[in-house]
């Protein structure tokens, strides 16, 4: 629909509260270093302007595009050049190049201080003193640290954040009530951010076709009773929503997401029997609920796939007439029958099928050529099954922390050039696949594990893209979206790597380690482990285990000592010497 004033249209559709929140998120995701107060000022100016356009859509500048209005506003920031350097050059460009320029400068790893959680009483006072500012600050801090966070979903998180404080700040034991809720929101938020980052990477690096294929597979698993035409409609609409959010068009994205949720709920009967509860909830909860809804039951009477996709004489005719539609139908039919497969596996099967048709439909006897195409699927299915089986056995044997350590060693040997903080972060997240997925029965393990690993490996890819240091990482990240995990799995020890010079400072520890949380202490130890492997990439598991066990004992001993600092200094020197001897450094 053509509207005289786009900003008025979105303000009316979304309402003032959501409009302001989404503009704040958009600005914070673009200008990640700007102080909170500056953003609030800009948002208020945009909101006042939007209100004038609601009152009179013909008013001056009301006909301008949102990119033009928001870009002009961002470019008024006085310290743009000093704070952002070359990003200031974006302001010399015209739309749409200016917006593209801002997008390219989004930083997945901004140099911002870690968010430290204040005391509960301090937070509750701040919440009561000015609830609106408190919640805006939450949106701002999350958005600037996660520049691709799915904006309408961040509104849902903020709603839960507010509910937690409303409830817990009145409780007898505020901390016992609030802290678990905040921990849950933090962990869910990180997961949500990472999942959305993969969607944006899929769209931006591999194009709309790649995203649509992912969506066909996932929605077909989730809604196996829905017709192909219905799934196709949902995929088209969902692609539009995510293209908008990934492109910084947050008002349009939130508006279209609400429309999609409305459509799904109005057409539940032809989509899924599992939507009833979701559709009774308010908008933000409804959209979240639909996005997380469990897979519907598969129709009982689904015929064999072979009839239409292998045995039919019309396979090449159907393929020639509409390649992507035919492949989409194949993917839909395969996915709805296989909720037990990961989406990336389904996409690999579809790619294999496509490659086979490309080759065989050129032949004089296509059927003779593609008759055995389904046999080619067997090794593709078995590879992730075997990998998950082996890794779940290892996880059950070691527990999460030691399983993470095994992955840290494995990945440091594969790509030792990658920065230590990135290796630690990524390997810790890879290791979480164990507690997240290995508890599931066989039928749910693969979709849980491999699709989660895709999300985590994408974190490695986006962090590495900022400062590329390894050709092997670049290759695995860029060649094929669906084969990233198999590509990394197939990497062996990098024989070209020149071991890092030994630096005693890297292995010098102080008494402050004793006051750290268990998680922070683990990170310290895992950082040391990565550095060890970088110094001695050929060290055996046994050697590394011995050194790490000695290290754990050293930390425990010194944290119990009366003079902790002296203990760390003296025993630390001994530990370094012993470790050097053990590893032959």
């Amino acid at each position: 629909d053509a509207h005289k004033s786009e900003v008025a249209h979105r303000f009316k559709d979304l309402g003032e509260e959501n409009f302001k929140a989404l503009v704040l998120i958009a600005f914070a995701q673009y200008l990640q270093q700007c102080p909170f107060e500056d953003h609030v000022k800009l948002v208020n100016e945009v909101t006042e302007f939007a209100k004038t356009c609601v009152a009179d859509e013909s008013a001056e500048n009301c006909d301008k595009s949102l990119h033009t209005l928001f870009g002009d506003k961002l470019c008024t920031v006085a310290t743009l050049r000093e704070t952002y350097g070359e990003m200031a050059d974006c302001c010399a460009k015209q739309e749409p190049e200016r917006n593209e320029c801002f997008l390219q400068h989004k930083d997945d790893n901004p140099n911002l201080p870690r968010l430290v959680r204040p005391e509960v009483d301090v937070m509750c006072t701040a919440f009561h003193d000015n609830e609106e500012t408190f919640l805006k600050k939450y949106l701002y801090e999350i958005a600037r640290r996660h520049p691709y966070f799915y904006a309408p979903e961040l509104l849902f998180f903020a709603k839960r954040y507010k509910a937690a404080f409303t409830e817990c700040c009145q409780a007898a034991d505020k901390a016992a009530c609030l802290l678990p809720k905040l921990d849950e929101l933090r962990d869910e938020g990180k997961a949500s951010s990472a999942k959305q980052r993969l969607k944006c990477a899929s769209l931006q690096k591999f194009g709309e076709r790649a995203f649509k294929a992912w969506a066909v597979a996932r929605l077909s698993q989730r809604f196996p009773k829905a017709e192909f035409a219905e799934v196709s409609k949902l995929v088209t609409d969902l692609t539009k929503v995510h293209t908008e959010c990934c492109h910084g068009d947050l008002l349009e994205c939130a508006d279209d997401r609400a429309d999609l949720a409305k459509y799904i709920c109005e057409n539940q009967d032809s989509i899924s029997s599992k939507l009833k509860e979701c559709c009774e909830k308010p908008l933000l909860e409804k959209s979240h609920c639909i996005a997380e809804v469990e897979n519907d039951e598969m129709p009982a009477d689904l015929p064999s796939l072979a009839a239409d996709f292998v045995e039919s004489k019309d396979v090449c005719k159907n393929y020639a007439e509409a390649k992507d539609v035919f492949l989409g139908m194949f993917l839909y039919e395969y996915a709805r029958r296989h909720p037990d497969y990961s989406v990336v596996l389904l996409l690999r099967l579809a790619k294999t099928y496509e490659t086979t048709l490309e080759k065989c439909c050129a032949a004089a006897d296509p059927h003779e050529c593609y008759a055995k195409v389904f046999d080619e699927f067997k090794p593709l299915v078995e590879e992730p099954q075997n990998l998950i089986k082996q890794n779940c056995e290892l996880f059950e044997q070691l527990g999460e922390y030691k399983f993470q350590n095994a992955l840290l060693v494995r990945y440091t040997k594969k790509v030792p050039q990658v920065s230590t903080p990135t290796l630690v972060e990524v390997s810790r997240n890879l290791g979480k696949v164990g507690s997240k997925c290995c508890k599931h029965p066989e039928a749910k393990r693969m979709p849980c594990a491999e699709d989660y690993l895709s999300v985590v490996l994408n974190q490695l890819c986006v962090l590495h893209e900022k400062t590329p240091v390894s050709d092997r990482v670049t290759k695995c990240c860029t060649e094929s979206l669906v084969n990233r995990r198999p590509c990394f799995s197939a990497l062996e020890v990098d024989e070209t790597y020149v071991p890092k010079e030994f630096n005693a400072e890297t292995f010098t520890f102080h008494a402050d380690i004793c006051t750290l949380s268990e998680k922070e202490r683990q990170i310290k130890k895992q950082t040391a482990l990565v550095e060890l492997v970088k110094h001695k990439p050929k060290a055996t598991k046994e050697q590394l285990k011995a050194v790490m066990d000695d290290f754990a004992a050293f930390v425990e001993k010194c944290c119990k000592a009366d003079d902790k600092e002296t203990c760390f200094a003296e025993e630390g020197k001994k530990l370094v010497a012993a470790s050097q001897a053990a590893l032959g450094l």
Epitope: K313, K317, A320, E321, E358, C361, A364, P366
Partner: nanobody, 115 residues
Amino acid sequence: EVQLLESGGGLVQPGGSLRLSCAASGFTFSSFGMSWVRQAPGKGPEWVSAIDSGGADTRYAETVKGRFTISRDNSKNTLYLQMNSLRPEDTAVYYCTIGRSTSRGSQGTLVTVSS
């Protein structure tokens, strides 16, 4: 939209010759193997001949082997069927198809062999 337009049919005496053409559009002709299929009055479709995308590999039904020759010109997006030594039993509607499909997606061209 895929379109296949056959031409070249007609009435011919037994022992005579005809050359059928099929002009293709709406898809990447040079990437697909093609076939000729025929349907005699009151009968089901019968595959006649096939050719791969490059024109190197050709196949024929036993009933036409040695008499018919399939060929293609990818620069013109056209498929051909040279029919020699025609017999009354070759009378049928001939149509071209993608791959080995026997479903009719076009009008076809009528070949009548009669004295």
